[in-house]
């Protein structure tokens, strides 16, 4: 029975050239988190494994930094970074929990954070 919920940073915006932290938090479950995947569409950005720690995909090494915590920091943002990002929590025994974040990278200097929201 999957009882957990994922809270994410929701819809967020950031300035071109800047950086942003993507954060997810799994709650309401006693399931063991074995790995967290960070993905953009179907591209794997990074993995945080309970045994191995962090692995950043080679193609993103220059612009992605692990943390804080199980979050992910995107640096040197471009307009092409606009889009959906997913945190996928692999847990036992529950299985897979997915959180969604939409990032908009703005040309202007007006970049405000959206509200937090939950995905069951």
């Amino acid at each position: 029975m999957m009882t957990g919920t994922i809270e994410t940073t929701g819809n967020i915006s950031a300035e071109k050239g800047g950086s942003i932290i993507l954060q997810c938090h799994l709650s309401s479950t006693t399931a063991q988190v074995t790995q967290v995947n960070w993905e953009q569409q179907d591209q794997l950005l990074a993995i945080c494994n309970a045994d191995l720690g962090w692995h950043i995909s080679p193609s993103f090494k220059d612009r992605v930094a692990p943390g804080p915590g199980l979050g992910l920091t995107l640096q040197s943002l471009t307009v092409n970074d606009t889009g959906e990002y997913f945190c996928i929590y692999h847990t036992y025994p529950d299985g897979t929990y997915t959180g969604r974040i939409f990032l908009e990278v703005l040309e202007s200097s007006v970049a405000e954070h959206g509200a937090r929201f939950q995905i069951p």
Partner: antibody, heavy 119, light 107 residues
Framework: EVQLVESGGGLVKPGGSLKLSCTAS????????MSWVRQSPEKRLEWVAE????????YYTDTVTGRFTISRDNAKNTLYLEMSSLRSEDTAMYYC????????????WGQGTSVTVSS | DVQITQSPSYLAASPGETITINCRAS??????LAWYQEKPGKTNKLLIY???TLQTGIPSRFSGSGSGTDFTLTISSLEPEDFAMYYC?????????FGGGTKLEIK
């Protein structure tokens, strides 16, 4: 080339024990979670157990919990499945398989080792 | 446990044809379904994962689709080496479970 070679299967009486091994080569064994999957004589596939890359976490299907123990020796590039209190329904071909780094399915399998539980 | 119903269990086709194999889950498994090929004397091969992502090295004539409870494996322009046993497997929650298999034979 990734290779997984199982061994240790055989004929055993009900209530008996057996230890299967799976020797890995061609990849950094310590970086991957590993699984045991079995195939019944009727060709049904069943996931049996899984172990994390460092061996810290182990998971089992309900029917083998308390009877089977999955373990690994990363220095020897070897995965193990220790089976006790064997039952006739444990008769199957046992495969070791490597879990994808992103955890989405099993990308390499061994050729299997046969276990027969019969009196 | 998530039950996976795979159909058909047997399929006969000719080289060059296009075939589909279906898997239905007893509850939603999001996109997390994998497809495997089993051939005598060879090790099982991962074809598709996460419903539609082609495993590295697998020919593009193999494709997967679906999400939620209903999934399909399509093999277009069948090659002689494609005649084999095919299994689907959900990798959404433990215990991971498999479909009963589809035997694809030459007509």
């Amino acid at each position: 080339e990734v290779q997984l070679v199982e061994s240790g299967g055989g004929l055993v009486k009900p209530g008996g024990s057996l230890k299967l091994s799976c020797t890995a080569s061609g990849f950094t064994f310590s970086s991957y979670a590993m699984s045991w999957v079995r195939q019944s004589p009727e060709k049904r596939l069943e996931w049996v157990a899984e172990i994390s890359s460092g061996g810290s976490y182990t998971y089992y299907t309900d029917t083998v919990t308390g009877r089977f123990t999955i373990s690994r020796d990363n220095a020897k590039n070897t995965l193990y499945l220790e089976m006790s209190s064997l039952r006739s329904e444990d008769t199957a071909m046992y495969y070791c398989a490597r879990k994808r780094r992103d955890y989405y399915g099993m990308d390499y399998w061994g050729q299997g080792t046969s276990v027969t539980v019969s009196s | 446990d998530v039950q996976i119903t795979q159909s058909p269990s047997y399929l006969a086709a000719s080289p060059g044809e296009t075939i589909t194999i279906n898997c239905r889950a007893s509850k939603s498994i999001s996109k997390y379904l994998a497809w495997y090929q089993e051939k005598p004397g060879k090790t099982n091969k991962l074809l598709i994962y996460s419903g539609s992502t082609l495993q590295t090295g697998i020919p593009s004539r193999f494709s997967g689709s679906g999400s939620g409870t209903d999934f399909t494996l399509t093999i277009s322009s069948l090659e002689p080496e494609d005649f084999a046993m095919y299994y689907c497997q959900q990798h959404n929650e433990y215990p991971w479970t498999f479909g009963g298999g589809t035997k694809l034979e030459i007509k």
